[in-house]
C-alpha cells in the first residue's frame, strides 16, 4: 500500500524497496497484483560501486530519491516531476483528493513531497487510477447499501477467480481451499442485481461464506507497505469504475475509521462489513 | 502460467494486406497493453505499437502509422495487428508482448512475456 | 525520440570470461530501460528492467547498472547458454526504441 502519513508519509525514512502494484481487474475486481520493484535511488549490482555508493541500500519514500550531500551523506530529497515519465496513456493517469489529473502517480507523489510539512500535503492523497472524473455525491441511502454490495460483490470476484484458475497464478492453493468451499455450496447466491433486502437476509443466512472475501481484500489491498492498515491510496482501487457504487467508496470507509486516524485497520474494516469480532483473523490476510 | 500465442507464418504477395494474432492466455486479457515489434532478418527491433484491450484504446509509432492497424477481441482474448499495402521491406517476424507495469506507487514499465512470433514474407 | 546506441555490435568471448554490454540514450531516461536476451529463431527474454533489476528467474551472473544516459550489462563468468544477441530498450516515453543489438559468440 502506497505510503502512509502516520507511519511514512510524513517523515523521513529509509525503508524497504517498495514492491509494485498494477491495477488487475479480475472480473471486475482491480486486485492489485506485484509486477516488480522500483527504486530510482542509484542502485547498483557490481559490488566495486556499491561500496563506493552510500545511496546504495538508503531507499526513499515515493516522490523521494537518495542524493548525497556534500559529507557523502545519503538523504532523501524530493524528486523532480521532469524525472517521471510521460504517460503513455490514459491508464496511467491519476487523479488526487482534490480532483487534479496527475500525469502518472510518479507526478503526483513528487508534488506531494513538495508540500510536505503543509497543510494542503498533509490533506493530499492519490484518489483513483485514472484522469479525474465527474462523481456523483454518495447520498444516504446508497450508504446504506454500500457494505451490502460490495461484501456481496467481493464475494463473487474470489468465485470468479476460482472458476478461471487454472494456472495456479491468481490464488495460491490455500485460498483455493477456502474458496471451493464456497463456491460448492449450494445456498450461494448467484452473482446479479438483488435487491438489498435479499442480499442482508443471505448474509445472515450465509455469514460464514462472506468472512475469507471480506479478509482477503484487505490483503489485496494492503501493499504499500504491508503493516495492516489501509491508506487513503490503498483504497484507491476500490475508487476504479468496476466497482459496485464507488461513488460512496470514500464516504463508506470514512465512516469506518472508528479511530479517525485516517488509516482503516483490519478490525475497523471486518466490522464495517458485518463481520464479528470473534471472526476477525489476521490469518485470513494472506 | 502466462502465455501469448501467435498465428502461424504468411506468405503474401506485395500490395496485399495480412492479418497476424497474438491470443493471450493465463491472466485478464484487459489487464494489461499488449504490444507489437518487428525484427527483420540480422537486424534489431523496431516498436510497432500497443493496444489496450480494456477500452480498445491505441499508440502508434509514427513510422507504422497507416502501415499497421491494432484491434482486439476481449471475447478471445486475442489482440490482431494488420499490415496493409505489403512490399518487400514487411517482410520480418513480427512480436507481440505484455507490458507489465506499475501505476499504484510509481511507473514501472517493461515486456515481461513475449509471444511465439510470426514470421510475414512478402514475395511475387 | 530517443535514440539508443549499442556496443559493440559483436563479441567473441570464452566461457568463464566476463563481458560488458554497453547502451547509450539520446536523452536522459531515468533508468527506464531494459535488457533482453534472444536465441537465434525464439522471442527475446527478459533480464534486467529499471535498468538495474534482475527479472524472476535470470541468474545472478546477470547485472545491469548505469543512469542518465549510458546504462550496460554485465556478465560475469559466462556459460555457454549465455551466448545469443542482447538488446537494451528504452519505456521513458513513446515510441519505446531498442539498440542495435550485441552479438555475443564462443570465441
Known amino acids: 500500500a502506497p505510503q502512509q502519513e502516520a507511519l511514512p508519509d510524513e517523515t523521513e525514512v529509509v525503508e524497504e524497496t517498495v514492491a509494485e502494484v498494477t491495477e488487475v481487474s479480475v472480473g471486475a475486481n482491480p486486485v492489485q497484483v506485484e509486477v516488480g520493484e522500483f527504486d530510482d535511488g542509484a542502485e547498483e549490482t557490481e559490488e566495486e560501486v556499491v561500496a563506493e555508493n552510500p545511496c546504495q541500500n538508503h531507499h526513499c519514500k515515493h516522490g523521494k530519491v537518495c542524493e548525497l550531500d556534500e559529507n557523502n551523506t545519503p538523504m532523501c530529497v524530493c524528486q523532480d516531476p521532469t524525472s517521471c515519465p510521460a504517460p503513455i496513456g490514459e491508464f496511467e493517469k491519476v487523479c488526487s483528493n482534490d480532483n487534479k489529473t496527475f500525469d502518472s502517480s510518479c507526478h503526483f507523489f513528487a508534488t506531494k513531497c513538495t508540500l510536505e510539512g503543509t497543510k494542503k500535503g498533509h490533506k493530499l492523497h492519490l484518489d483513483y487510477i485514472g484522469p479525474c472524473k465527474y462523481i456523483p455525491p454518495c447520498l444516504d441511502s446508497e450508504l446504506t447499501e454500500f457494505p451490502l454490495r460490495m461484501r456481496d460483490w467481493l464475494k463473487n470476484v474470489l468465485v470468479t477467480l476460482y472458476e478461471r484458475d487454472e494456472d495456479n497464478n491468481l490464488l495460491t492453493e490455500k485460498q483455493k481451499l477456502r474458496v471451493k468451499k464456497i463456491h460448492e455450496n449450494e445456498k450461494r447466491l448467484e452473482a446479479g442485481d438483488h435487491p438489498v433486502e435479499l442480499l442482508a437476509r443471505d448474509f445472515e443466512k450465509n455469514y460464514n461464506m462472506y468472512i475469507f472475501p471480506v479478509h482477503w481484500q484487505f490483503g489485496q489491498l494492503d501493499q504499500h507497505p504491508i503493516d495492516g492498515y489501509l491508506s487513503h491510496t490503498e483504497l484507491a482501487p476500490l475508487r476504479a469504475p468496476l466497482i459496485p457504487m464507488e461513488h460512496c467508496t470514500t464516504r463508506f470507509f470514512e465512516t469506518c475509521d472508528l479511530d479517525n486516524d485516517k488509516y482503516i485497520a483490519l478490525d475497523e474494516w471486518a466490522g464495517c462489513f458485518g463481520i464479528k469480532q470473534k471472526d476477525i483473523d489476521k490469518d485470513l490476510v494472506i | 502460467q502466462v502465455q501469448l500465442q501467435q498465428s502461424d507464418a504468411e506468405l503474401v504477395k506485395p500490395g496485399a494486406s495480412v492479418k497476424i494474432s497474438c491470443k493471450v492466455s493465463?491472466?485478464?486479457?484487459?489487464?494489461?497493453?499488449i504490444h507489437w515489434m518487428k525484427q527483420r532478418p540480422e537486424q534489431g527491433l523496431e516498436w510497432i505499437g500497443y493496444i489496450y484491450p480494456r477500452d480498445g484504446s491505441t499508440k502508434y509509432n509514427e513510422k507504422f502509422k497507416g502501415k499497421a492497424t491494432l484491434t482486439a477481441d476481449k471475447s478471445s482474448s486475442t489482440t490482431y495487428m494488420q499490415l496493409n499495402s505489403l512490399t518487400s521491406e514487411d517482410s520480418a517476424v513480427y512480436f507481440c508482448?505484455?507490458?507489465?507495469?506499475?501505476?499504484?506507487?510509481?511507473?514501472?514499465?517493461?515486456?515481461?512475456?513475449w509471444g511465439t512470433g510470426t514470421t510475414v514474407t512478402v514475395s511475387s | 525520440d530517443i535514440q539508443m546506441t549499442q556496443s559493440p555490435a559483436s563479441l567473441s568471448a570464452s566461457v568463464g570470461e566476463t563481458v560488458t554490454i554497453t547502451c547509450r540514450a539520446s536523452g536522459n531516461i531515468h533508468n527506464y530501460l531494459a535488457w533482453y536476451q534472444q536465441k537465434q529463431g525464439k522471442s527475446p527474454q527478459l533480464l534486467v528492467y529499471n535498468a538495474k533489476t534482475l527479472a524472476d528467474g535470470v541468474p545472478s551472473r546477470f547485472s545491469g547498472s548505469g543512469s542518465g544516459t549510458q546504462y550496460s550489462l554485465k556478465i560475469n563468468s559466462l556459460q555457454p547458454e549465455d551466448f545469443g544477441s542482447y538488446y537494451c530498450?528504452?519505456?521513458?516515453?513513446?515510441?519505446?526504441?531498442f539498440g542495435s543489438g550485441t552479438k555475443l559468440e564462443i570465441k
Open positions: 530498450q528504452h519505456f521513458w516515453s513513446t515510441p519505446f526504441t
Open positions: 508482448a505484455r507490458l507489465a507495469f506499475g501505476i499504484i506507487t510509481t511507473v514501472v514499465r517493461y515486456f515481461d512475456v
Open positions: 493465463g491472466y485478464t486479457f484487459t489487464d494489461h497493453t
